[in-house]
Amino acid sequence: QSVCAGTENKLSSLSDLEQQYRALRKYYENCEVVMGNLEITSIEHNRDLSFLRSVREVTGYVLVALNQFRYLPLENLRIIRGTKLYEDRYALAIFLNYRKDGNFGLQELGLKNLTEILNGGVYVDQNKFLCYADTIHWQDIVRNPWPSNLTLVSTNGSSGCGRCHKSCTGRCWGPTENHCQTLTRTVCAEQCDGRCYGPYVSDCCHRECAGGCSGPKDTDCFACMNFNDSGACVTQCPQTFVYNPTTFQLEHNFNAKYTYGAFCVKKCPHNFVVDSSSCVRACPSSKMEVEENGIKMCKPCTDICPKACDGIGTGSLMSAQTVDSSNIDKFINCTKINGNLIFLVTGIHGDPYNAIEAIDPEKLNVFRTVREITGFLNIQSWPPNMTDFSVFSNLVTIGGRVLYSGLSLLILKQQGITSLQFQSLKEISAGNIYITDNSNLCYYHTINWTTLFSTINQRIVIRDNRKAENCTAEGMVCNHLCSSDGCWGPGPDQCLSCRRFSRGRICIESCNLYDGEFREFENGSICVECDPQCEKMEDGLLTCHGPGPDNCTKCSHFKDGPNCVEKCPDGLQGANSFIFKYADPDRECHPCHPNCTQGCNGPTSHDCIYYPWTGHSTLPQHARTP
């Protein structure tokens, strides 16, 4: 199917009507599926719109407004999905289609195959010359039982309208027998839960059909309610992971497909990325784009998503000399600084000659997200009330690709600083270190700086800071939980490494094996929280003995094979079918009888759960991904 992007211009149009028509044609010529909204506005009366005959499906809304043409040739439009609605209400909006000072305007809707609006209402009004729209049984087309005020269709705009052909039983899109409205819902047997192709019980369409069908199978649908998988309408596309009943785990499905609009595709179009089995134009803000095996995918960011920003003297900050109040907001949510960070007096204290105010010290917290500086870090000024550089607590790497007089780290004459607090700093890839004349700075002498270096020709000048013996005398020493590797400042979170155990960044005496709110296991010298599916045991007993839901002493909810799970598999996609299980009195999961296709309460075919005329449209996944 040829797919095109829709628009979201509402009623705004190009001032040049010729261009407006050309743009419409360019968008929709040879387009079968409009991924978005189909907006037809400000088109003159003599324009050839026959190219619209190719459109069969619109995922958003259809807007036809402020036009002068006589006939709307959307003859093959079968379904409007209404994933976006006009004015948040209408899937189909047709209004003001006439010329105020003349005889031109919309007379006939050529929507003779429109049999399904999945979401949203219909608004047809103020079309001076329009005929037949008021004969249409819109309730047959609109899927949801929308409030009546959301299906507003005014009576004939013109007194000169003809009647429907007698074979149409009073419902038609135009005057001939070819213009009769095809009813596919209100004429069905009451046992049909959806559409039908005749009045009998045997004439029900498959529940996955939308807009009608030519037969009872999922391959006989005119359109799909959810997804079209190689011609068959399905509730969901073949999932990325399928449940393996032997291993009790979700495993990679090599037959997986991605949802692209209402289609299941083996591969997303080249300008799309995969997000949770869907093809999307861009990753959401909480995810980042990565490439795996040649496929661009959206992966959840562990905390904040990577964002590269220009540093001082680079790109948009090429002419800047220092971080200051006029540019500090450019560093919001940055994780990587391409270039340098420089803090000078005129930045920190302001520059009245250039009308730059002093930095609000609180704003320096923007640097808490920075993990990498590709150039150098130069601190020659800092707010007097800030005693450390903890705003750089997440800085891991200083690249030194650009150096300042051979330096990649420079901290000079900061009398207010008592500790550096670069607690994540692991590497200074190139360049020298120069930390001098910081008369109150302690802890610097506990660190073996050369362990941060990547090359043998890197050097250090750390001089004329607070004397080590003075620091010790005043108790400005590493926390007792730190190892002999030293620390960046006071407290158990500033250690380069731990004497005993660590929980995240913090050094601790011991893990919460047998007590504490959150129970843990020991992975070497690291304390790791037990899986959330493990039941917290009473004090003195281990809650788990390793990672994952298969290492619990006892399950919090249910047990599926060796794994503790939130609930037993209930419609998980297996290799060839959906997997349903029930829980026994011991809360262990067991497979339902093969005849149970919608779940069960026990092991026999008599225990099947039967949901009349409904499908599992969203299938929860409660199994372990390896």
Epitope: T322, V345, S405, K413, N457, R463
Partner: antibody, heavy 119, light 110 residues
């Protein structure tokens, strides 16, 4: 006592090179900066470049880039300044001066070396 | 043409006070410490003031200095004939990564 002692006066022809030395004593040579500052007859002071011996790499003023080379020999506590492609405008007194590091004032100066460039 | 400017000359009678100005930009004086040097005829310069307003040991308190924004000043009170010399201000320039000096001011004690 901190001291900087420079080599003697030089007379050079245009196009030639000159190498002036500056021997330091009385302090930890490697972690303090040595800069070269020149003064043409009747003119002001002009910074040419500098080096902190422990770092090894020198920093040069753009004007002299490519023509000047500053090196340090830590075994003899001596810093050298070599200026190539000499022209008559390079006639000046060349001073070495110590600073505690980058961005610091020049607290000790050598006695100066007069370099005359004349054909 | 120096990036830091000083008046070419100033003069005053013995015992009087004289002020020498030094004007630069945010990249040098504005963002860095200013130092002042005295150069007596035929000798090397000598450090007079560092870190905007501090005197090295041995420099009399007749010499004082201050900095405001992108300008600095040197004050000499109780002028003596031995103060007759050239005076230079200096600072690091963060943009150019060089040390810069003012053009120098010749002080004449009348």
């Amino acid at each position: 006592e901190v001291q900087l002692v420079q080599s003697g006066a030089e007379v050079k022809k245009p196009g030639a090179s000159v190498k002036v030395s500056c021997k330091a004593s009385g302090y930890t040579f490697t972690s303090y900066g040595i800069s070269w500052v020149r003064q043409a007859p009747g003119q002001g002071l002009e910074w040419m470049g500098g080096i902190i011996p422990i770092f090894g790499t020198a920093n040069y003023a753009q004007k002299f880039q490519g023509r000047v080379t500053i090196t340090a020999d830590t075994s003899t506590s001596t810093v050298y300044m070599e200026l190539s492609s000499l022209r008559s405008e390079d006639t000046a007194v060349y001073f070495c001066a110590r600073s505690r590091g980058y961005y610091d004032p020049f607290d000790v100066w050598g006695q100066g070396t007069l370099v005359t460039v004349s054909s | 043409q120096s990036v830091v400017t000083q008046p070419p000359s100033v003069s005053a009678a013995p015992g009087q006070k004289v002020t020498i100005s030094c004007s630069g930009s945010s990249s040098n004086i504005g963002n860095n410490y200013v130092s002042w040097y005295q150069q007596l005829p035929g000798t090397a310069p000598k450090l007079l003031i560092y870190d905007n307003n501090k005197r090295p040991s041995g420099i009399p308190d007749r010499f004082s200095a201050s900095k405001s924004g992108t300008s600095a000043t040197l004050d000499i009170t109780g002028l003596q004939t031995g103060d007759e010399a050239h005076y230079y201000c200096g600072a690091w320039d963060s943009s150019l990564s060089v040390a810069v000096f003012g053009g120098g001011t010749k002080l004449t004690v009348l």
